[in-house]
């Protein structure tokens, strides 16, 4: 189910690269944050807390990955036209509960700007 | 068809103690969260406690946490509530009922008991 | 914690009006918001789900709107099954329900 685009700049470019913008409600303890290029999962990454809230970061699929207090940003680097497509964040809710997850994405247009290496 | 049915509910003095049960049938226990729901006479409904499937993560309304620990087991398809140091504010009829889901995850209470009275007096 | 405001508390309505019941939250829940039935000596039946789905076996003379803070219950068409008291319940952070809107006979 998607639940929507995202209403916010879901894409950042900076020196031939994209930072991927995946936001959370501030509210959310614990939660799996994946990017999904299309239907294929391309990074994740799983906070929760321990006993004494000390809190895990986990990836199963690494990419550089920054976390913040309501958003994860996801960074793809040597742009090429290939990496055009539709990106969402897929957000799996685990605490505060019930269990909920929520879809938001956007199409990643590529301009020759934006790419890499261009030839001048 | 899919049930909940609850018992163990009685009369008990305010600091006692009561376990409620929750047998399920129909469904496959093991694969649902569940909770127990509460409404007190003539009022409306206060969640009470939640347990995942694996029984690994617990949570509890403010109004009952230390006193309250919900259980479950999935080999004997049943939800367990063991109420301690009872309050006249906790007469109520307990509801065990199943959190639902689906591809977004919760939908809210899809099955629910009969309901067991609990009621704490002196 | 979130509240759940619901209005009216009490409703009078006759068989074949059309009824809204409106919930209001105390901050964003999104659209994690559930509608229930509950009949005296009843235990609640669930009839929506994520603010707009309906619950399969539900009818369909109930649909349910909005999303952030406002939502509604609407009957369509309201038939003698359909007096009871109705319950909206937020899901988005734990769980808290309204305090319920009785459908009574005018």
């Known amino acids: 189910e998607i639940n929507g685009s995202a209403n916010y700049e879901m894409f950042i470019f900076h020196n031939g690269g994209v930072q991927i913008l995946c936001k959370y409600p501030d509210i959310v303890q614990q939660f799996k944050m994946q990017l999904l290029k299309g239907g294929q999962i391309l990074c994740d990454l799983t906070k929760t807390k321990g006993s004494g809230n000390t809190v895990s970061i986990k990836s199963l699929k690494f990419c550089h990955s920054q976390l913040s207090n309501n958003s994860v940003s996801f960074f793809l680097y040597n742009l090429d036209h290939s990496h055009a497509n539709y990106y969402f964040c897929n957000l799996s809710i685990f605490d505060p509960p019930p269990f909920k997850v929520t879809l938001t994405g956007g199409y990643l247009h590529i301009y020759e700007s934006q790419l890499c290496c261009q030839l001048k | 068809q899919v049930q909940l049915v609850e018992s163990g509910g009685d009369l008990v003095k305010p600091g006692g103690s009561l376990r409620l049960s929750c047998t399920a049938s129909?469904?496959?226990?093991?694969?649902?969260?569940m909770d127990w729901i509460r409404q007190a006479p003539g009022k409306g409904l206060e969640w009470v406690s939640y347990?995942?499937?694996?029984?690994?993560?617990?949570y509890y309304a403010d109004s009952v946490k230390g006193r309250f620990t919900i259980s479950r087991d999935n080999a004997k398809n049943s939800l367990f509530l063991q109420m301690d140091s009872l309050r006249a504010e906790d007469t109520a009829v307990y509801y065990c009922a199943r959190d639902a889901h689906y591809v977004s995850g919760s939908k809210g209470v899809d099955v629910w008991g009969q309901g067991t009275t609990v009621t704490v007096s002196s | 914690d979130i509240q759940m405001t619901q209005s009216p508390s009490t409703l009078s309505a006759s068989v074949g009006d059309r009824v809204t019941i409106t919930c209001r939250a105390s901050?964003?829940?999104?659209?994690?918001l559930a509608w229930y039935q509950q009949k005296p000596g009843k235990a609640p039946k669930l009839l929506i789900y994520?603010?707009?789905s309906l619950e399969s076996g539900a009818p369909s003379r109930f649909s349910g709107s909005g999303s952030g803070t406002q939502f509604t219950l609407t009957i369509s068409s309201l038939q003698p099954d359909d007096f009871a008291t109705y319950y909206c319940?937020?899901?988005?952070?734990?769980?808290?329900f309204g305090q319920g809107t009785k459908v009574e006979i005018k």
């Open positions: 901050q964003s829940i999104s659209s994690w």
């Open positions: 994520k603010a707009s």
């Open positions: 347990i995942s499937s694996s029984g690994d993560t617990i």
């Open positions: 129909g469904f496959t226990f093991s694969d649902y969260y």
């Open positions: 319940q937020q899901y988005y952070s734990y769980w808290t």
